[in-house]
């Protein structure tokens, strides 16, 4: 391993998964590295092998148990180390005392569906996946709608500052194809970030009734 610029970032999905990304400029693609997890108040230790995701970036998932099991709490600390093989020994490349609930990134929302669609309006609902019951209602959402001829990056963000797993989109154009995405973020945690965007939900507004004023 080379002493290039390095970055080690991990997030907890609030249930049973810690996902980590390790990047290092100038490191060889076939460098063998792993993440080792050593909790302060649990009996288990965990290791995952870092696998290449790009030229100088590796990722792995520490799977702590069944997807919906609550494996860590707000008082847990897990010491995470990146270990890379150098000849016959392992070298510590990065280390952090990881506080799971300060470093949250939830799974993308799932089960998006059109509840009701009209000519100018569409009501959409979704569900959150593998989210801790500890949050109660302390979650927020961002949503975006892709209009014809535009990109996702151009789509304005709609912010829902509470745990509201539905939205009513208004001022839509009749008989038009749209796509919709949503993401979620807990309010807790200094380093907490948005979940990935959900899979896009495609829908079409109803055509305007013939002879009616629209």
């Amino acid at each position: 391993a080379v002493n290039g610029t390095s970055q080690f970032t991990c997030f907890y999905n609030s249930r049973a998964n810690i996902s980590c990304v390790w990047s290092q400029d100038g490191a060889l693609q076939d460098t063998s590295c792993q993440v080792h997890a050593w909790p302060d108040r649990r009996r288990w230790n965990q290791t995952c092998e870092l696998l290449p995701v790009s030229q100088a970036s590796w990722a792995c998932n520490l799977i702590l148990g069944a997807p919906d099991s609550q494996k860590l709490t707000t008082v847990d600390i897990v010491t995470l180390r990146v270990l890379c093989r150098e000849g016959v020994r392992w070298r510590v490349m990065a280390i952090q005392d990881f506080k799971p609930f300060e470093n949250l990134r939830l799974m993308a929302p799932i089960s998006l569906q059109v509840v009701h669609v009209e000519t100018h309006r569409c009501n959409i609902s979704w569900e959150i996946s593998q989210a801790s019951h500890y949050f109660e209602r302390h979650l927020e959402f961002e949503a975006r709608t892709l209009s014809p001829g535009h990109t996702w990056e151009e789509a304005p963000l709609l912010t829902l500052k509470q745990k509201q797993e539905w939205i009513c989109l208004e001022t839509l154009t009749p008989d038009t194809q749209y796509e919709f995405q949503v993401r979620v973020k807990p309010l807790q945690g200094e380093f907490t970030t948005w979940s990935p965007w959900s899979q896009p939900l495609a829908f079409r507004t109803k055509p305007a009734a013939l002879g009616k004023d629209t």
Epitope: A1, N3, T5, S6, Q7, F8, T9, W38, D40, I77, T79, R81, R91, V92, M93, A94, I95, Q96, D97, F98, K99, E102, N103, E190, F191
Partner: nanobody
Framework: QVQLVESGGGLVQPGESLGLSCAAS????????MSWVRQAPGKGLEWVSS????????DYADSVKGRFTISRDNAKNTLYLQMNSLKPEDTAVYYC???????????????????RGQGTQVTVSS
């Protein structure tokens, strides 16, 4: 705003001990790795020791290993450096430094610090 205030420096004889403290404020102390660095007269900045946010991981420069101990009290937002068996070559201004995240990188331990205190002078002389 982030503040780091070192104290405990002074003049000691070779072989004696000294304890440095660093009082931190303006950030969630326990979320960040911290380090001690030093600068001898006419020299560049030299890394001394690092510690993870909860104090579960520590690391030392070869020149101080076995003589210096880094620790922290997160309830008091304070970082410590206990220096034993001091040598004339330990003479320097000692700074406490905050890393920009919870992570530090042992192969490049000075990289990634974003704040440093004003420093406290340690002089080892007979």
């Amino acid at each position: 705003q982030v503040q780091l205030v070192e104290s405990g420096g002074g003049l000691v004889q070779p072989g004696e001990s000294l304890g440095l403290s660093c009082a931190a404020s303006g950030f969630t102390f326990s979320n960040y790795a911290m380090s001690w660095v030093r600068q001898a007269p006419g020299k560049g900045l030299e890394w001394v020791s690092s510690i993870t946010g909860a104090g579960r991981g520590t690391d030392y420069a070869d020149s101080v290993k076995g003589r210096f101990t880094i620790s922290r009290d997160n309830a008091k937002n304070t970082l410590y450096l206990q220096m034993n068996s001091l040598k004339p070559e330990d003479t320097a201004v000692y700074y406490c430094a905050k890393y920009s995240s919870g992570t530090y990188y042992p192969p490049t331990p000075v990289r990634g610090t974003d704040y440093r205190g004003q420093g406290t002078q340690v002089t080892v002389s007979s």
